[in-house]
Interface confidence: low
């Protein structure tokens, strides 16, 4: 025997209190599939969360974060404070990157500069708190007697790490 609830479309629920007829989801709730016996409560984007997409009878609300914060976790389950480039977020707030480290984004941690010498290369552009170093060609890349002109480094523009 077919379950009468299977005929209830998305946006409704199968109401056992009313002889299993399909009732519209109540305010601020939704059902994204048919045949549901209850509707789910819509997510509320409050405080530091901001509504990215409103709830409807068939789909949940989606949140993002207010300016100065960014999403973390699946479906933006948390909002974390932004820092400036050249900083990282600690328990005591935004702190400048220590010497020898950088962060080119408003989120995440400071990472060590690339060690050019590990690849047998020299430092072409020094690193900063906001940018990684740019590694240049190794001394052996030049033949004796060849003028040591500076060569463009692929991917060496600001914001890119050259390994």
């Amino acid at each position: 025997l077919q379950d009468p609830c299977s005929n209830c479309p998305a946006g409704t629920f199968c109401d056992n209190n009313r002889n299993q007829i399909c009732s519209p989801c109540p305010p601020n709730s939704f059902s994204s599939a048919g045949g549901q016996r209850t509707c789910d409560i819509c997510r509320q984007c409050k405080g530091v969360f901001r509504t990215r997409k409103e709830c409807s009878s068939t789909s949940n609300a989606e949140c993002d974060c207010t300016p100065g914060f960014h999403c973390l976790g699946a479906g933006c389950s948390m909002c974390e404070q932004d820092c400036k480039q050249g900083q990282e977020l600690t328990k005591k707030g935004c702190k400048d990157c220590c010497f020898g480290t950088f962060n080119d984004q408003k989120r995440g941690i400071c990472r060590p500069w690339t060690n050019c010498s590990l690849d047998g290369k020299s430092v072409l552009v020094n690193g900063t708190k906001e940018r990684d170093v740019v590694c240049g060609p190794s001394p052996t890349d030049f033949s004796p007697g060849t003028p040591s002109t500076t060569m463009p480094v692929p991917g060496g523009e600001p914001g890119h790490t050259s390994h």
Partner: antibody, heavy 114, light 110 residues
């Protein structure tokens, strides 16, 4: 982010009229949109909603005579069988189940007179 | 449809005074209530949503409370700029109950 209504004018009773709400700075796929009207010297009166999925909700008095539809950047209100009682400023407003109506257009005046 | 009954229709208070506007819903509206301010010839401006949450940029002189069927908006330390008409608004409609506005309260600041 802004809303702008257009299409309001003087019409005679029985004339159909379509109002348009043009949105900028946000996507209609992410917000419910409503039409609300206000007769001269009177209060606000809700006409209907279109939700993010395109589903429509109307005030009981508006069903049949008012139709809401949308494109990617506009929300239209089609009105038929207009009477002098429909003379009002018509507003479009953004918002749904979370915040109420957080953004309003300046309104467009519809005058129905013989 | 839900009916929102707003009282009083008009109130007059001096600068620095306090005004309270009440709104009664014909059935439980679960705090899906907003308050708006409207000045003549202007669009409404949202002040409160969720019965008590202050909208961004709204001074803390505006406060609201309520649950179930009874809600109230309070304006303290009245300023001349607060002279306007205020509306309550039930805004959840998925149930088919329909959206509804109160009839409005005119606030006159003396």
């Amino acid at each position: 982010q802004s809303l702008e209504e257009s299409g309001g004018r003087l019409v005679t009773p029985g004339t159909p009229l379509t109002l348009t709400c043009t949105v900028s700075g946000f996507s209609l796929n992410d917000y419910w949109m409503s039409w609300v009207r206000q007769a001269p010297g009177k209060g606000l009166e809700w006409i209907g909603y279109i939700d993010v999925g395109g589903s429509l909700y109307y005030a009981s008095w508006a069903k049949g005579r008012f139709t809401i539809s949308r494109t990617s950047t506009t929300v239209d209100l089609k009105m038929t069988s207009l009477t002098t009682e429909d003379t009002a400023t018509y507003f479009c407003a953004r918002g749904g189940l979370t915040y109420g109506f957080d953004l309003w257009g300046p309104g467009t005046l519809v005058t129905v007179s013989s | 449809d839900i009916v929102m009954t707003q009282t009083p229709a008009s109130v007059s208070e001096p600068v620095g005074g306090t005004v309270t506007i009440n709104c009664q819903a014909s059935e439980d509206i679960s705090s899906y209530l907003a308050w708006y301010q409207q000045k003549p010839g202007q669009r409404p401006k949202r002040l409160i949503y969720g019965a008590s949450d202050l909208a961004s940029g709204v001074p803390s002189r505006f406060s609201a409370s309520g649950s179930g069927t009874e809600y109230a908006l309070t304006i303290s330390d009245l300023e001349s700029a607060d002279a306007a008409t205020y509306y309550c608004h039930y805004y959840a409609t998925i149930s088919g109950l329909g959206v509804a506005f109160g009839g409005g309260t005119e606030v006159v600041v003396k």
